[in-house]
């Protein structure tokens, strides 16, 4: 015998209290697949979270983070404080990158400057706290007497893609 609940589409639930008829999900709840016996409570984007997509009867709300914070975890389960370019977030707050490391975004960690010599290249542009080095040609490609290192480009607002 076919389960009568299998006829209930997304956005409804199979209501045992009403002889297994398909009832619409109550306000602030949803069912994203058919044949559900209950509707799930909608996620609420509160505090540092803000609503990116409203809840509907067939899909959950989606949250992102208020300005100054960025998403972490699957489905933006957490919001983490932004730092400035040239910094990383530690337990004690935002700290400048140590010499030899950089962070060109508002999130994430300070990473070591690229070691150009690993690729047999020279340093074309020095690194800063905000920027990686730019590797240039191999030292053998440089003309005699040519200076190989350019001063770093001025720091600028990083491109970062909140996630």
């Amino acid at each position: 015998l076919q389960d009568p609940c299998s006829n209930c589409p997304a956005g409804t639930f199979c209501d045992n209290n009403r002889n297994q008829i398909c009832s619409p999900c109550p306000p602030n709840s949803f069912s994203s697949a058919g044949g559900q016996r209950t509707c799930d409570i909608c996620r609420q984007c509160k505090g540092v979270f803000r609503t990116r997509k409203e809840c509907s009867s067939t899909s959950n709300a989606e949250c992102d983070c208020t300005p100054g914070f960025h998403c972490l975890g699957a489905g933006c389960s957490m919001c983490e404080q932004d730092c400035k370019q040239g910094q990383e977030l530690t337990k004690k707050g935002c700290k400048d990158c140590c010499f030899g490391t950089f962070n060109d975004q508002k999130r994430g960690i300070c990473r070591p400057w690229t070691n150009c010599s690993l690729d047999g290249k020279s340093v074309l542009v020095n690194g800063t706290k905000e920027r990686d080095v730019v590797c240039g040609p191999s030292p053998a490609d440089l003309s005699p007497g040519a200076s190989s290192v350019t001063p770093p480009a001025p720091a600028r607002e990083p491109g970062h893609s909140p996630q």
């Epitope: 060109d104 074309l124 920027r131 990686d132 080095v133 590797c135 240039g136 607002e157 491109g159 970062h160």
Partner: antibody, heavy 119, light 107 residues
Amino acid sequence: QVQLVQSGAEVKKPGASVKVSCKASGYTFTSYWINWVKQAPGQGLEWIGNIYPSDSYTNYNQKFKDKATITADKSTSTAYMELSSLRSEDTAVYYCTRDYGSSYSFDYWGQGTTVTVSS
Amino acid sequence: DIQMTQSPSSLSASVGDRVTITCRPSQDISNYLNWYQQKPDGTVKLLIYYTSRLRSGVPSRFSGSGSGTDFTFTISSLQPEDIATYFCQQGDTLPYTFGQGTKLEIK
């Protein structure tokens, strides 16, 4: 020599997912960013996102944030990009690329993987 | 996002001609401007990085110049093997963005 070898062409139905691979060789995989770039038929190039295989740190173009998931497997020196909920506008050639010394230009490119979405 | 305005979208020139392509970002990108060549078979190659630096192995007829919001790519003497589409790309700010491309044909 540095090589990025991508998986073969795929034909998928709307709503399906596809996972494209990019196997790197000839360099230390964990030390360079791998980027993914889209080229729709007759169109220009669009940056989708990148990954730093050492710690799997990713950046995404907001436009592709809900479409693409980029991962990397250090043990096989392979990067992956999964595209979900495929639609006809996802029909394109997808390239993986490596950065040049630092993550601001792309010095090596894979041969491209054609993904066709058709019912 | 930074918009990259590349011109012309196509051009036809003769072997030996000097060819110039321009790229104008919508905001200052310092020197983080790169040029790529895409052959008809889809193969993509980096030619110029950091505005003017010729990638190792690339012929010296290719060159680049500019800074900030105005960049130029030049082929000093066009060769038959230069038939391709050329793209500029900014590496200053995420998301990285490309120009729409210049399709180069031989007269």
